[in-house]
């Protein structure tokens, strides 16, 4: 920032609440879509341009005027892998976090016209092109259909789909939210011959029911019913099938071949948790027991002579955890070599750090190709010579991210491709590789303004800057912006990282109010090197509040010793560590220890509430948005991963003594704002309703706000503005700010 160190002499405006709510200062992205190993699509002024990666020249792929007469607002588009057709998405209707329904039309790029025959039906739940060519698979009314050609009729693959009961090729609520992070449960083989799919059966899954009030004119509220397995409840069951799309015919039903779960899974409740095609005729499936410390990978080959899929027991790979659960949130996906005979996978090593291990399909043991007291975040690309990965190794900062390549013929030859490109500005990278990894886009998201650059893998040479946010930089020169401090404290000989958003002209000799912004769920990270323009930016810039976040026990990317510390004990160490962090911050000399607040959303709302109910005396006030209040209210897959089952034989005791309600009495010592959306399908309004009831029952005065018909994100324009305005008032009142 230009200006002076003296706040009083700085006449520049601050970053205001209105700036946040109205998004006055916009970060520019550079969202590209690779269509080959040397070309990508980029949308500019609603024209779709095709760029040559090597030379940077572009041509118009599709003019913005093409669909002027279309009559619908196009929500999204998708080009077939052979570049012959474009799928247009409109009539988008959101369902849950990832799921939605929409209408689709197909435009023939050669004929320059819409295909009018054999159209995809309205309210389609999912559509996907085959990886090559232009076959289409889609799900409508919970059944799967395939189109061999866009203008040909659809072949119906399944006939069992039933709303809220049987889901073919799409996930039910809990699989969408907690397992696949997607609505799709369809997987094309690499050349589009086979279509694999999961079928979920929710027949016995209990329903969550809540009112949806809708328009004022609706006399009786609608009741929304969703199959939602809470902790310990009956779970969905899953089956897995593969269909050969070359076999499809209108006059006979498609034959789907089932691949059953391994015997070690069939003995009890289990999940399908990963599907990865290894070759055209080899598929890997990962299955996970309901008690999520044991998983099995099956590798299955197509037997042409029988038309069946065979999964040899000798090729099974077991992954288990003795200290917690498998994977960060689920077992990681394998990255197969071209021949499909070996793969690379991120797993926990002996020291409990997540690293890349090399597996051969016929051997049980694997060879770690990375090691150290840091973690590999993700495998980004695999070629015949190199594996590319993102890790937080650089400078020992868990909150950083850099791109590395490792030579497959010599694992000691590791190069960091991003570390030294722009070390002050850029410490947190993600990457997007072209189809065969000849080129890659680096996306730097902090600590400076986001920077997008294009690179060649041949020599790792930077080709060009795609977006540097210079316009935003110029605008922000005229704003008193906060600074960000990323550091660690040592507790019990362990480093724990924190970040602080510090007011402009921060003076460590002064006393500032502090707001602890908390999430603290398993494998979370709130202390990082990312640049953000958010509510905290306003609080620091305009209200001179320090906004801090702390990654305590249970947080991720620093080894299992830290992450698994809260195994079977949610609501303990991660809560205590936030309190301890606040104590440590108040000892730093620049925090007004009479004005410390805490706030969080979702898991952060739970931790906020548990902290405020702890009776620590550290916090004056706090805000919990959409909090969990009792783990028996939350979904089975997430909750049981960390808590086991709410049964006397397993972990019922801790389920019962980790509730917010049991701490109601202690809320008399704090100011509390409780907020929840009434149509929250994820953390049900029930959770806040029970907190409210418990507080009322012991005579605690508190503030509350509900958001009618809002879900877990409270993201509609009006509700978003209202909640942040409301919370701002609450914090300002708590801190006695004008």
């Amino acid at each position: 920032n230009k200006g002076t160190d003296d706040a009083t002499a700085d006449s520049r405006k601050t970053y205001t609440l209105t700036d946040y709510l109205k998004n006055t200062y916009r970060l520019k992205l550079y969202s590209l879509r690779w269509i080959s190993d040397h070309e990508y699509l980029y949308k500019q002024e609603n024209n779709i341009l095709v760029f040559n990666a090597e030379y940077g020249n572009s041509s118009v792929f599709l003019e913005n005027s093409t669909f002027d007469e279309f009559g619908h607002s196009i929500n999204d588009y998708s080009i077939s892998p052979d570049g012959q057709f474009i799928l247009l998405e409109y009539n988008y209707v959101k369902q849950w976090r990832h799921s939605y329904t929409a209408s689709y039309d197909i435009y023939d790029l050669n004929k320059r016209q819409l295909i009018t025959e054999e159209r995809i039906p309205n309210n389609t739940q999912w559509v996907t092109w085959s990886p090559v060519g232009h076959k289409l698979a889609y799900v409508w009314n919970n059944d799967i259909y395939v189109k061999i050609e866009p203008n040909l009729p659809s072949y119906r693959i399944t006939w069992t789909g039933k709303e809220d009961i049987i889901y073919n090729g799409i996930t039910d609520w809990v699989y969408e939210e907690e397992v696949f992070s997607a609505y799709s449960a369809l997987w094309w083989s690499p050349n589009g011959t086979f279509l694999a799919y999961a079928q979920f059966n929710d027949t016995e899954v209990p329903l969550i029911e809540y009112s949806f009030y809708s328009d004022e004119s609706l006399q009786y509220p609608k009741t929304v019913r969703v199959p939602y397995p809470k902790a310990g409840a009956v779970n969905p069951t899953v089956k897995f099938f593969v269909v050969n799309t070359d076999s499809l015919s209108s006059v006979t039903n498609a034959t789907s071949i089932q691949i059953t779960a391994p015997a070690s899974m069939l003995i009890g409740d289990h999940y399908l948790c990963d599907v990865t095609w290894a070759t055209q005729e080899r598929i890997s499936l990962q299955w996970l027991r309901r008690i999520q410390n044991y998983s099995v990978m099956d590798i299955c080959d197509y037997d042409e002579s029988s038309g069946r899929w065979n999964c040899l027991v000798a090729r099974q790979h077991i992954e288990m955890s003795t200290t917690g659960w498998v994977g960060r949130f689920r077992p990681s996906e394998p990255h197969f070599t071209l021949d499909g005979n070996s793969f690379y996978k991120i797993i926990s090593n002996e020291e409990g750090y997540r690293h890349i291990c090399y597996f051969q399909i016929d051997k049980k043991d694997c060879t770690f190709i990375t090691k150290g007291t840091w973690e590999v975040i993700g495998i980004e690309a695999l070629t015949s010579d190199y594996l590319y990965y993102i890790s937080n190794e650089y400078k020992g900062m868990p909150g950083g991210r850099n791109l590395y390549k490792i030579q497959l013929s010599d694992y000691t030859k590791v190069t960091c491709l991003s570390c030294e490109l722009n070390p002050e500005r850029c410490q947190y990278y993600s990457v997007s590789f072209s189809k065969e990894a000849k080129y890659y886009q680096l996306r730097c998201s902090g600590p400076g303004l986001p920077l997008y650059t294009l690179h060649s893998s041949v020599n790792d040479k930077g080709l060009r800057v795609l977006e540097d946010n210079s316009a935003l930089d110029k605008m922000l020169q005229n704003v008193q912006m906060p600074s960000k401090k990323l550091d660690f404290i040592i507790l019990n000989e362990t480093k724990f990282w924190y970040q602080m958003i510090l007011p402009p002209h921060f003076d460590k000799s002064k006393k500032y109010p502090l707001l602890l912004d908390v999430y603290a769920g398993p494998c979370s990270q709130k202390a990082d090197t990312v640049f953000r323009l958010n509510w905290a930016t306003y609080l620091a810039s305009t209200e001179n509040i320090i906004v801090a976040s702390f990654d305590g026990r249970g947080s991720g990317y620093q080894g299992d010793k830290i992450m698994h510390a809260i195994n079977r004990r949610l609501g303990t160490f991660e809560v205590e560590d936030q309190i301890e962090a606040a104590r440590q911050f108040s000892k730093m000399g620049f925090v007004d220890n009479k004005r410390i607040a805490i706030w969080g959303w979702s898991y952060g709302g739970y931790v906020t509430s548990m902290v405020l109910g702890s009776g620590s005396g550290v916090f004056k006030c706090g805000i919990a948005v959409a909090p969990v209040s009792r783990w028996e209210y939350y979904d089975s897959v997430y909750t049981e991963r960390y808590m086991g089952l709410p049964t006397p034989e397993d972990n019922l005791d801790h389920y019962r003594n980790s509730t917010v309600m049991s701490r109601a009495e202690n809320f008399k010592q704090v100011e509390y704002l409780l907020i929840h959306g009434t149509a929250d399908d994820n953390v049900h309004f029930q959770q806040s309703a029970q907190i409210s009831k418990a507080l009322v029952d012991v005579g605690v005065d508190f503030q509350a706000m509900w958001y009618t018909d809002e879900d877990h994100g409270i993201a509609s324009s009006t509700a978003h503005q209202h909640i942040y305005t409301h919370m701002s008032h609450f914090i300002k009142q708590c801190f006695s700010l004008p």
Epitope: S247, L248, S249, S250, T255
Partner: antibody, heavy 116, light 107 residues
Framework: EVQLVESGAGVKQPGGTLRLTCTAS????????VHWVRQAPGKGLEWVGV???????DYDAAFMSRVTISKDTSKSTVYLQMNSLRAEDTAVYYC??????????WGQGTTVTVSS | DILMTQSPSSLSASPGDRVTISCRAS??????LNWYQQKPGQAPRLLIY???NLHSGVPDRFSGSGSGTDFTLTISRLEPEDFAAYYC?????????FGSGTKVEIK
């Protein structure tokens, strides 16, 4: 290269049994269905039946009681067996590969004559 | 069974002529109609699938149209090698049925 070759041509006795073989190459019988069609001299094409990739069969009702289509995937062969032959069964018999809803490859045909 | 009626049963034409052959289904078969060409002493070969889609390797002088019950095969400019029999076939319902054929002869 996809090919279908029929064999089993010849003169058959009325009341006798016909067994034709269709040898397939260049594709898998577990993926594609194989149909049989016949053509009487100077006449049009008449569908007899099909064996699908998964082994299920369908027949024209006119042949249901006396026709069996089977296959040996290890030998890449499909068989058509027809019992109780009569003079009207005299025809060229073709096997064809089913590609979705059309026949994209045909055998050259094999001639069967039913005569005493 | 679905009855497929082809017309005419035969026609005479000269090279360079435009020829149309008609096929009618006894019930709605949507677009599930294929056309085959058969030369004397040879097996039929696929020309057009699903009413209007040209099979690979088939010259573009052949075209198909229609849906529901009425379909047409058109040869825009007859070539000497096009003199043959042409059959339509429905593929929407078993049993599969063919038209009785149209013989295109040299005038």
């Amino acid at each position: 290269e996809v090919q279908l070759v029929e064999s089993g041509a010849g003169v058959k006795q009325p009341g006798g049994t016909l067994r034709l073989t269709c040898t397939a190459s260049g594709f898998s019988l577990t993926t594609y269905g194989v149909h049989w069609v016949r053509q009487a001299p100077g006449k049009g094409l008449e569908w007899v039946g099909v064996i699908w990739g998964d082994g299920r069969t369908d027949y024209d009702a006119a042949f249901m009681s006396r026709v069996t289509i089977s296959k040996d995937t290890s030998k890449s062969t499909v068989y058509l067996q027809m019992n109780s032959l009569r003079a009207e069964d005299t025809a060229v018999y073709y096997c064809m590969r089913n590609r979705h809803d059309w026949f994209d490859y045909w055998g050259q045909g094999t001639t069967v004559t039913v005569s005493s | 069974d679905i009855l497929m009626t082809q017309s005419p049963s035969s026609l005479s034409a000269s090279p360079g002529d435009r020829v149309t052959i008609s096929c009618r289904a006894s019930q709605d078969i949507r677009n599930n109609l294929n056309w085959y060409q058969q030369k004397p002493g040879q097996a039929p070969r696929l020309l057009i699938y699903y009413s209007s889609n040209l099979h690979s390797g088939v010259p573009d002088r052949f075209s198909g149209s229609g849906s529901g019950t009425d379909f047409t095969l058109t040869i825009s400019r007859l070539e000497p090698e096009d003199f043959a029999a042409y059959y339509c076939q429905q593929s929407i319902k078993l049993p599969l049925t063919f038209g009785s054929g149209t013989k295109v002869e040299i005038k």
